[in-house]
């Protein structure tokens, strides 16, 4: 043999019960002690420190705390130093050292010692991770190191959690004993925070001990709080709230179009949008995630705003007879009423649409002019003007004529055309043509699509001359012999060589 002692490094006992500390020791056989004596010390291995003597084989003298409460169960001669402590109280909790006394110089306090823990609650052992939906085993363990009093176990608050299975008395690694009862069940998320209890009672005594454990059930997030769709006026403040139930708390993330806007580990997360713009209109997603799963929900944000200034696209110049298509479009929320006016006359209108198509089949000169596209909703009105130019061959209007007065003849040639025509006056009897470029004789004035050219003739009175007015543009030429109004003497101006 060699010097050594074996005892549990720790051992537990319920207050008021007893505890048997199993202990054996060894020493070299050649020491051959005639008698083996021993001492149990409390809290210190050194007699110099005058530690309380728990038990001493040579004498009956023990510390008052252990008077009548300590007894050696083991036989020191058989190298068994097992100690029994009865009616244990909290002050007996601590370290217990055994000192072998073999005579001569061979007294030895073994460094191995036992720490006694006086408990008053059963130990409920819950696995480090309890996941909702996965079967779990919860055990209640109590020390069973008192040969005189044996504990009986029962569960408290386990209704609906399955029937307990009693494992009975089990030996632990270091020779201590425990009573164990098991509970198997599949926890739900609702079981999180549930208090599960275990009671140890000792038959034929009033001793009863209870312990409780709160279930920490892990479960994936479920989003439980979320705005329904939100409408907000441009420039206003918007708060989007997302709340989730999970354990542990989830990582909450607000996203839009794949971009993370805000995230935090929390049970709820507020997304604050200051002075919203139409650009922030859209679908916002809240993602809740923890190690056990995830959930996501979306909310639509509708930003309400007045229409933008309409834009007009299409042909702004057309040839008479062509079909003209003009598109007026805007952006607003809600969609606007779109109307196209010409000279206060409604030509086309749509309700709650963002674009309006105006179709003018076979345009005529009357279609030429200024148009307005007006967009309006409850938040405002915007308008855009545009001009449609209809091009056509000259038309000589009926008000074209010649009139004589004293010594002059004035001929008016009134032409409607687009683009502006060139005008020429022809006097066939004289084989003369006067162009509008000849400012001495011709004065032209345009008003809209109407060009008025005036030919002034001066000279002797004669028979009224024939005057033919010809108007010409890229679409064609029109001629008209100008009628005379009233028979007056004709004044004549010599034109030409």
């Amino acid at each position: 043999g060699h010097w050594g002692a074996w005892m549990p490094s720790s051992i537990s006992a319920f207050e008021g019960t007893c505890v048997s500390i199993p202990c054996r020791f060894d020493f070299p056989d050649e020491l051959r002690p005639a008698v083996v004596h021993g001492v149990w010390y409390f809290n210190s291995p050194y007699p110099k420190n005058y530690p309380p003597v728990v038990f001493k084989s040579r004498t009956q003298v023990v510390h008052e705390s252990f008077q009548g409460r300590s007894r050696l169960l083991g036989d020191l001669g058989l190298r068994n130093c097992t100690l029994l402590l009865s009616n244990v109280s909290p002050e007996l909790g601590g370290k217990y050292y055994f000192r072998g006394d073999l005579g001569g110089y061979n007294q030895y306090t073994f460094s191995e010692h036992s720490v006694l823990d006086i408990v008053n609650t059963p130990n409920i052992v819950v696995p480090p991770e309890v996941v909702a939906g996965t079967e779990v085993e919860v055990s209640c363990m109590v020390p069973d190191n008192c040969p005189e009093l044996r504990p009986e176990l029962s569960w408290l608050g386990h209704e609906g959690l399955g029937e307990p299975a009693v494992l009975g008395r089990l030996r632990e690694d270091e020779g201590t004993w425990v009573q164990v009862s098991l509970l198997h069940f599949v926890p739900t998320r609702e079981a999180n925070g549930h208090r599960l209890g275990c009671q140890a009672s000792f038959p034929n005594t009033t001793l009863q001990f209870e312990g409780y454990a709160s279930m920490d059930v892990k479960y994936p997030p479920v989003i439980v709080e979320m705005n329904s769709s939100v409408e907000a006026i441009e420039g206003s403040h918007v708060s989007l709230l997302c709340g989730a139930d999970s354990n542990p708390p989830p990582l909450l993330t607000w996203m839009r179009d794949g971009t993370v806007l805000r995230e935090a580990v929390a049970e709820s997360l507020l997304l604050e949008l200051e002075e919203v713009t139409p650009a922030e209109d859209g679908v916002y997603a809240c993602l809740a995630e923890n190690a056990y799963g995830q959930d996501n929900r979306t909310v639509g944000l509708s930003v309400m705003y007045a229409p933008w200034k309409p834009t007009v696209n299409g042909t702004m110049v057309a040839v008479e007879g062509e079909t003209v298509s003009i598109l007026c479009s805007t952006q607003s929320n809600p969609d606007p009423i779109l109307t196209i006016f010409k000279e206060k006359q409604i030509l086309s209108t749509v309700i709650y649409e963002s674009e309006l198509q105006l179709e003018l089949p076979a345009v005529s000169p009357e279609d030429d002019g200024e148009y307005w596209c007006v967009a309006e909703n409850q938040y405002g009105q915007r308008a855009t003007a545009f001009n449609l130019s209809v091009e056509f061959a000259p038309v000589l209007l009926l008000e074209s004529h010649c009139a004589a007065a004293r010594d002059t003849v004035q001929c008016l040639c009134v032409v409607k055309s687009n683009p502006e025509p060139s005008v020429a006056f022809e006097l066939p009897s004289r084989n003369v043509t006067v162009n509008e470029s000849e400012r001495e004789f011709v004065y032209s004035e345009r008003s809209g699509l109407v060009l008025t050219s005036i030919l002034t003739l001066r000279g002797q009175a004669q028979a009224p001359p024939r005057v033919i007015c010809t108007a010409r543009n890229l679409y064609g030429a029109k001629s008209l012999e100008l009628p005379f109004q009233g028979a007056h003497r004709l004044m004549w101006a010599k034109i030409g060589p």
């Epitope: 010097w3 070299p28 020491l31 051959r32 002690p33 110099k48 001569g104 007294q107």
Partner: antibody
Framework: QVQLVQSGSELKKPGASNKVSCKAS????????MNWVRQAPGQGLEWMGW????????TYADDFTGRFVFSLDTSVSTAYLQISSLKAEDTATYFC???????????????????WGQGTLVTVSS | DIVMTQSPDSLAVSLGERATINCKSS????????????LAWYQQKPGQPPKLLIY???TRESGVPDRFSGSGSGTDFTLTISSLQAEDVAVYYC????????FGQGTKLEIK
């Protein structure tokens, strides 16, 4: 140098008590245990036991339990042997002798008594 | 307890001659853990305390003349004085300190 100086000879009546002192010097008192050895006139040596000067724990040989008490006063580096209820057969020279110790008190190193006091003769006679 | 028996009880040797004292233990004093013999020899002159000569069965204490030597193992041990001097006249004790300490009865050494 190491010295163990014992108290002087004593003549005692049967039933009386006697206390022999052993004052140590020249070394650290608590690093060495103190043994007590008895030698009756014309007889051999008998080991009575020892006291661990570090822990204060006495150990008595089987023949010397009861009337014999070992004690210490470490402040003056002195060990004491008290004999009560003296008997005629207690007449002897009592020696103190030191031996090295370790703090656990196990004699694994095989410490031996290396220095002895001069002895104290205790005579018990009526 | 381990009983130590010395022989002879007394011994007379001429000056300068070798003196041999034997000691037998009732049980081995060889400690298996360190393979050492827990045996010492003491010299005691009249009116004086014992003086340590040898420990570990063969290790000479400092200051002890080298004419003193110890030998043996287990249960049989010997103290040898190689050349006896007049000042060596004394009683010699063997002593085991493995278990509860015991001494031999002593051997008285005289000059022949």
């Amino acid at each position: 140098q190491v010295q163990l100086v014992q108290s002087g000879s004593e003549l005692k009546k049967p039933g009386a008590s006697n206390k022999v002192s052993c004052k140590a010097s020249g070394y650290t008192f608590t690093n060495y245990g103190m043994n007590w050895v008895r030698q009756a006139p014309g007889q051999g040596l008998e080991w009575m036991g020892w006291i661990n000067t570090y822990t204060g724990e006495p150990t008595y040989a089987d023949d010397f339990t009861g009337r014999f008490v070992f004690s210490l006063d470490t402040s003056v580096s002195t060990a004491y042997l008290q004999i009560s209820s003296l008997k005629a057969e207690d007449t002897a020279t009592y020696f103190c002798a030191r031996n090295p110790i370790n703090y656990y008190g196990i004699n694994y190193e095989g410490y031996v008594m290396d220095y002895w006091g001069q002895g104290t003769l205790v005579t018990v006679s009526s | 307890d381990i009983v130590m028996t010395q022989s002879p009880d007394s011994l007379a040797v001429s000056l300068g001659e070798r003196a041999t004292i034997n000691c037998k233990s009732s049980h081995s004093v060889l400690y298996s853990s360190n393979q050492k013999n827990y045996l010492a020899w003491y010299q005691q002159k009249p009116g004086q305390p014992p003086k340590l000569l040898i420990y570990w069965a063969s290790t000479r204490e400092s200051g002890v003349p080298d004419r003193f030597s110890g030998s043996g193992s287990g249960t049989d041990f010997t103290l040898t004085i190689s050349s006896l001097q007049a000042e060596d006249v004394a009683v010699y004790y063997c002593h085991q300190y493995l278990s509860s300490l015991t001494f031999g009865q002593g051997t008285k050494l005289e000059i022949k």
